[in-house]
């Protein structure tokens, strides 16, 4: 005997009161596959989410998390609270970044400095809580009369002061 | 499926008290810190109380000593027993999976109403 379940499309559900009929999903449900015998219940963004997609009697809806919060986990399971930029979340809440270390987002830890001069390089502004260091030309390269443009000077004479 | 459903919401005056319930199914409760936030439109989302697998508790300053939250792990249930209330108590309650930082809310929650 066939199973005229499997020709019950997504958005429907095989109804088996009713001799195997497809029977639209009802309000507030959806199947997203073919030959289902039960439709899900649909997802309600409530509390500390938003609906970000309606549901459909083929989809699930997708929720957001409101202001102040973000996303976490498959499909937006949780949400986190914002930090400020400058700060990261401790178990204690959200705390400024220690000196050495940013945080340029609401999310996330706060990440060390960029160190310059392991890439030999010299420090073009400082960093703050927010941003990052900003690494210059090394501190060769800012030397008088120095361009990158040109290949370096030969070595100096004992005695001879540079210009 | 995840599924919270809260009830005991309800109008009262300022000083009484009330017994929210949460029921949960779809995932292993004992394993979970559950808890309590309230929202009033227009107003931030507000973490209320917590209770971790252990049993060990929080509260926002807000309801410290008014408020106190317990768990039954045998009916998967948590609860928020509410005392000394106040106008501003007045808000939508929602139970919580997850901690003070980061937690869901999967249910329709339930109306709390403090007025004389």
């Known amino acids: 005997l066939q199973d005229l379940c499997s020709n019950c499309p997504a958005g429907t559900f095989c109804d088996n009161n009713r001799s195997q009929i497809c029977s639209p999903c009802p309000p507030n449900s959806f199947s997203s596959a073919g030959g289902q015998r039960t439709c899900d219940i649909c997802r309600q963004c409530k509390g500390v989410f938003k609906t970000r997609k309606e549901c459909s009697s083929t989809s699930n809806a997708e929720c957001d998390c409101i202001s102040g919060y973000h996303c976490l986990g498959a499909e937006c399971s949780m949400c986190e609270q914002d930090c400020k930029q400058g700060q990261e979340l401790t178990k204690k809440g959200c705390k400024d970044c220690c000196f050495g270390t940013f945080n340029d987002q609401k999310r996330g830890i706060c990440r060390p400095w960029t160190n310059c001069s392991l890439d030999g390089k010299s420090v073009l502004v400082n960093g703050t809580k927010e941003r990052d260091v900003v690494c210059g030309p090394s501190p060769a390269d800012l030397s008088p009369g120095a361009s990158s443009a040109t290949p370096p000077a030969p070595a100096r004479e004992p005695g001879h002061s540079p210009q | 499926q995840v599924q919270l459903v809260e009830s005991g919401g309800g109008l009262v005056q300022p000083g009484g008290s009330l017994r929210l319930s949460c029921v949960a199914s779809g995932f292993v409760f004992s394993t979970v810190t559950m808890g309590w936030g309230r929202q009033v439109p227009g107003k931030e989302f507000e973490w209320v109380s917590g209770?971790?697998?252990?049993?060990?508790?929080d509260y926002a300053d807000s309801v410290k000593g008014r408020f106190t939250i317990s768990r039954d792990n045998a009916k998967n249930t948590v609860y928020l027993e509410m005392n000394s209330l106040k106008s501003e108590d007045t808000a939508e309650y929602y139970c919580?999976?997850?901690?003070?930082?980061?937690?869901?809310?999967w249910g329709q929650g339930t109306q709390v109403t403090v007025s004389s």
């Open positions: 919580l999976i997850g901690g003070r930082w980061s937690f869901g809310t």
């Open positions: 209770v971790s697998s252990e049993g060990i508790t």
